[in-house]
């Protein structure tokens, strides 16, 4: 059974992931980003279901495409280079989803823009955090 300390750690990691995703979204989804329209041409795959930490597998598999899009953005939009930012997110995702069980991600038929993709995973983090508090 999860202890209060492990629950707290999970909550902090989710909050960190949430802040990173929100920072990316705010950095790209505004009219001051001249590459926004170009970024919106990139296609992202969405999870069929995202209600548990194991479903973060679906996010992990889309981190490389996310990095490619972020490479279009100016570095001043973020406090880190895209490679470092994605690496940090990857570390958190791996810790949160755990590596004990291998979960095969199921994707929805509908694809999404980077904005829809980020909003979906932001909602996921907020939802899980709310169940922990």
């Amino acid at each position: 059974a999860p202890t209060s300390s492990s629950t707290k750690k999970t909550q902090l990691q989710l909050e960190h992931l949430l802040l990173d995703l929100q920072m990316i979204l705010n950095g790209i989804n505004n009219y001051k980003n001249p590459k926004l329209t170009r970024m919106l041409t990139f296609k992202f795959y969405m999870p069929k279901k995202a209600t548990e930490l194991k479903h973060l597998q679906c996010l992990e598999e889309e981190l490389k495409p996310l990095e490619e899009v972020l490479n279009l953005a100016q570095s001043k939009n973020f406090h880190l280079r895209p490679r470092d930012l994605i690496s940090n997110i990857n570390v958190i995702v791996l810790e949160l989803k755990g590596s004990e069980t291998t979960f095969m991600c199921e994707y929805a038929d509908e694809t999404a823009t980077i904005v829809e993709f980020l909003n979906r995973w932001i909602t996921f983090c907020q939802s899980i955090i709310s169940t922990l508090t």
Partner: antibody
Framework: QVQLVQSGGGVVQPGRSLRLSCAAS????????MNWVRQAPGKGLEWVTL????????YYADSVKGRFTTSRDNSKNTLYLQMNSLRAEDTAVYYC????????????WGQGTMVTVSS | SYELTQPPSLSVSPGQTATISCSGD??????AYWYQQKSGQAPVLVIY???RRPSGIPERFSGSSSGTMATLTISGAQVEDEADYFC???????????FGGGTKLTVL
């Protein structure tokens, strides 16, 4: 209504210069990145250049780099394309086009203006 | 440089279905957009993000994408649909917008 009205086309000799203008109305011009796209007679569409909302960032197709310069005057709601060292292959209809902020394409286009480079 | 390949022309009778293909290596990871350009006019967006239709575009226009191929379908083509159709996306890296060569649709 949202509109882009172009002016400044014409016939020009090779090696000479020409400036195109694109006047925007019906939307907050200073909130949008803007493009120029051209179409040679009987040919397809070719993206030429992009300028950011404030004019601080500019991107060009390789075919025009070093010869064409895009600029904007947000106080006049106007986009410009300065074309220098013109070549016969620059002959085309030139369109100004607005970058959408919600989808990955150009969502508003000007009516187009013809530029003919000929001796 | 990155290329999108379309058939140069297509002819259908009124009421028939017109299917225009666009091939590009980046499509598994890029959305396709379709512009309609009638003679002497500026292009108009008819499909965005593979399948979505802007408001004001008739329901007979639809889009799909699978693998490296994007498709524009006009179900029950009308005489007024006669135009050039261009597919569009960005280069693999996303830096440059790219248009297909265009397909001239004749409806007669």
């Amino acid at each position: 209504q949202v509109q882009l009205v172009q002016s400044g086309g014409g016939v020009v000799q090779p090696g000479r210069s020409l400036r195109l203008s694109c006047a925007a109305s019906g939307f907050t011009f200073s909130n949008y990145a803007m493009n120029w796209v051209r179409q040679a007679p009987g040919k397809g569409l070719e993206w030429v250049t992009l300028i950011s909302y404030d004019g601080s960032q500019k991107y060009y197709a390789d075919s025009v780099k070093g010869r064409f310069t895009t600029s904007r005057d947000n106080s006049k709601n106007t986009l410009y394309l300065q074309m220098n060292s013109l070549r016969a292959e620059d002959t085309a209809v030139y369109y100004c086009a607005r970058d959408s902020t919600t989808l990955g394409a150009f969502d508003v286009w000007g009516q187009g203006t013809m530029v003919t480079v000929s001796s | 440089s990155y290329e999108l390949t379309q058939p140069p022309s297509l002819s259908v009778s009124p009421g028939q279905t017109a299917t225009i293909s666009c091939s590009g290596d980046a499509f598994p990871r890029k959305f396709a957009y379709w512009y309609q350009q009638k003679s002497g006019q500026a292009p108009v967006l008819v499909i965005y993000e593979d399948t979505r239709r802007p408001s004001g575009i008739p329901e007979r226009f639809s889009g799909s994408s699978s693998g490296t191929m994007a498709t524009l379908t006009i179900s029950g083509a009308q005489v007024e649909d006669e135009a050039d159709y261009f597919c569009y996306t960005t280069s693999s890296s996303g830096t440059h917008p790219v248009f297909g060569g265009g397909t001239k649709l004749t409806v007669l």
